[in-house]
């Protein structure tokens, strides 16, 4: 498992090319999904086939901003949705207490460097209780694919490690020890420690979220400025697991 974590973390270290040629990335989404009224649903997007650095992900419903995950500032949820929207898993978004009014198009907008903006579309249909039982099936292809990819990668790594161990047992010992130490170090990130490239972490400079401790004029200015955003951070979102 440590090897897996290390591999995923290492993906985030890939250097983006200096000049953008063509946008090669693709966004896989959960597609058209349906869910039960009163229930919850996970909106998931996955950016792949690019080495571009993800700097921010916006979630929008039609032209309304639901949430932002910023590499420096962490998660921020719109005030009109803060009781019903939860960040994650990953860069996804969880919608709770669904109503029929939640039916519609949702967009994940990946801001990347140097490629630019990638947009994924999900159509959500909120159904009355009994009709929605088949809804979860729509999510299986993407989540299954992601899980399968991880399993394949982990298996490949384990096989390679096992074979290499047989051939070069002594050398692997020292290398593995070193990697294990690095891996353990990454599991112990603290807010004061520099975060790895692409991780979406709450910035130390703004511990109370985008408003900081200035609850008055500055927050009012930000609310007016953004119309829809509530500036309280909701923790971390990891970009480095996202590009494949």
């Amino acid at each position: 498992m440590r090897w897996c974590l290390l591999l995923i973390w290492a993906q985030g270290l890939r250097q983006a090319p200096l000049a953008s040629g063509m946008m090669t990335g693709t966004i896989e989404t959960t597609g058209n999904i349906s869910a039960e009224k009163g229930g919850s649903i996970i909106l998931q997007c996955h950016l792949s086939s690019t080495t571009a650095q993800v700097t921010q992900v916006n979630w929008e419903q039609q032209d309304q901003l639901l949430a932002i995950c910023n590499a420096d500032l962490g998660w921020h949820i719109s005030p009109s949705f803060k009781d019903r929207v939860a960040p994650g898993p990953g860069l996804g978004l969880t919608l709770q207490s669904l109503t029929v009014n939640d039916t519609g198009e949702y967009f994940c907008i990946y801001h990347t460097y140097p490629d630019g903006t990638y947009t994924g579309r999900i159509f959500l249909e909120v159904l009355e209780s009994s009709v929605a039982e088949h809804g979860a099936r729509f999510q299986i292809p993407l989540l299954g694919a992601m899980a399968a990819t991880l399993v394949v990668i982990c298996t490949a790594v384990i096989v390679v490690v096992a074979l290499t161990r047989k051939k070069k047992a002594l050398r692997i010992h020292s290398v593995e020890g070193d990697l294990r130490r690095k891996s353990a170090g990454q599991e112990e990130w603290s807010p004061s420690a520099p975060s790895p490239p692409g991780s979406c972490v709450q910035a130390e400079a703004a511990p109370a979220g985008l408003c900081g401790e200035q609850r008055g004029e500055d927050c009012a200015e930000l609310h007016d400025y953004f119309n829809v955003l509530s500036y309280r951070s909701l923790g971390n979102c990891s970009f480095f697991t996202e590009t494949g």
Epitope: T55, L65, G116, T117, T119, Y225
Partner: antibody, heavy 119, light 107 residues
Framework: DVQLVESGGGLVQPGGSRKLSCAAS????????MHWVRQAPEKGLEWVAF????????YYADTVKGRFTISRDNPKNTLFLQMTSLRSEDTAMYYC????????????WGQGTSVTVSS | DVQITQSPSYLAASPGETITINCRAS??????LAWYQEKPGKTNKLLIY???TLQSGIPSRFSGSGSGTDFTLTISSLEPEDFAMYYC?????????FGGGTKLEIK
């Protein structure tokens, strides 16, 4: 009120250096990405450099890459542009601008500071 | 880089009229185009971003439309204070690029 005030401009010789500053007030500086944009005499606007709120992302225009360095001091609410190996074509009015939180559009601009590169 | 061609470069109109300014991108920039107003002695002002979203505090006579490569800024019922320089900027991808500008003058 959001305010951005640039300083540090002036006359510089070709090959010389200059450091521009942008003092920000009226908002939580550490939460916003910042841009430098310039405008040569009788010309249009040209984006120069960008730095994200926590300095994790820094980008430059090809015309200044390797010569200019953008940085920020969040506790002091100040943005910087260190310019080296200056050329006559760098002569321009330099503006700092705040990035919107959601997109790379620039929602507040300073008045600008003038840099003239000439011998 | 994305080239932005702005037209016309010069426009004369009278207060009360409706005018349009166009920007064309050399490749698709989705909806990510912003419009700015530049006036002597004042700081540049963001009018529209993401193609059609009105920036807070900007009068509703300003509107933006378009997506892909073709975008339009419309100012309906021109006010005396609207006569200024206008620029468009793509904020879709690095490096961010501007149009050449449109000077709007009183006829």
């Amino acid at each position: 009120d959001v305010q951005l005030v640039e300083s540090g401009g002036g006359l510089v010789q070709p090959g010389g250096s200059r450091k521009l500053s942008c003092a920000a007030s009226g908002f939580t500086f550490s939460n916003f990405g910042m841009h430098w944009v310039r405008q040569a005499p009788e010309k249009g606007l040209e984006w120069v450099a960008f730095i994200s709120s926590g300095s994790s992302s820094i980008y430059y225009a090809d015309t200044v890459k390797g010569r200019f360095t953008i940085s920020r001091d969040n506790p002091k609410n100040t943005l910087f542009l260190q310019m080296t190996s200056l050329r006559s074509e760098d002569t321009a009015m330099y503006y700092c601008a705040r990035m919107r939180l959601d997109y790379y559009a620039m929602d507040y601009w300073g008045q600008g500071t003038s840099v003239t590169v000439s011998s | 880089d994305v080239q932005i061609t702005q037209s016309p470069s010069y426009l004369a109109a009278s207060p009360g009229e409706t005018i349009t300014i166009n920007c064309r991108a050399s490749k698709s920039i989705s909806k990510y185009l912003a419009w700015y107003q530049e006036k002597p002695g004042k700081t540049n002002k963001l009018l529209i971003y993401s193609g059609s979203t009105l920036q807070s505090g900007i009068p509703s006579r300003f509107s933006g439309s378009g997506s892909g490569t073709d975008f339009t800024l419309t100012i309906s019922s021109l006010e005396p204070e609207d006569f200024a320089m206008y620029y468009c900027q793509q904020h879709n991808e690095y490096p961010w690029t501007f149009g050449g500008g449109t000077k709007l003058e009183i006829k």
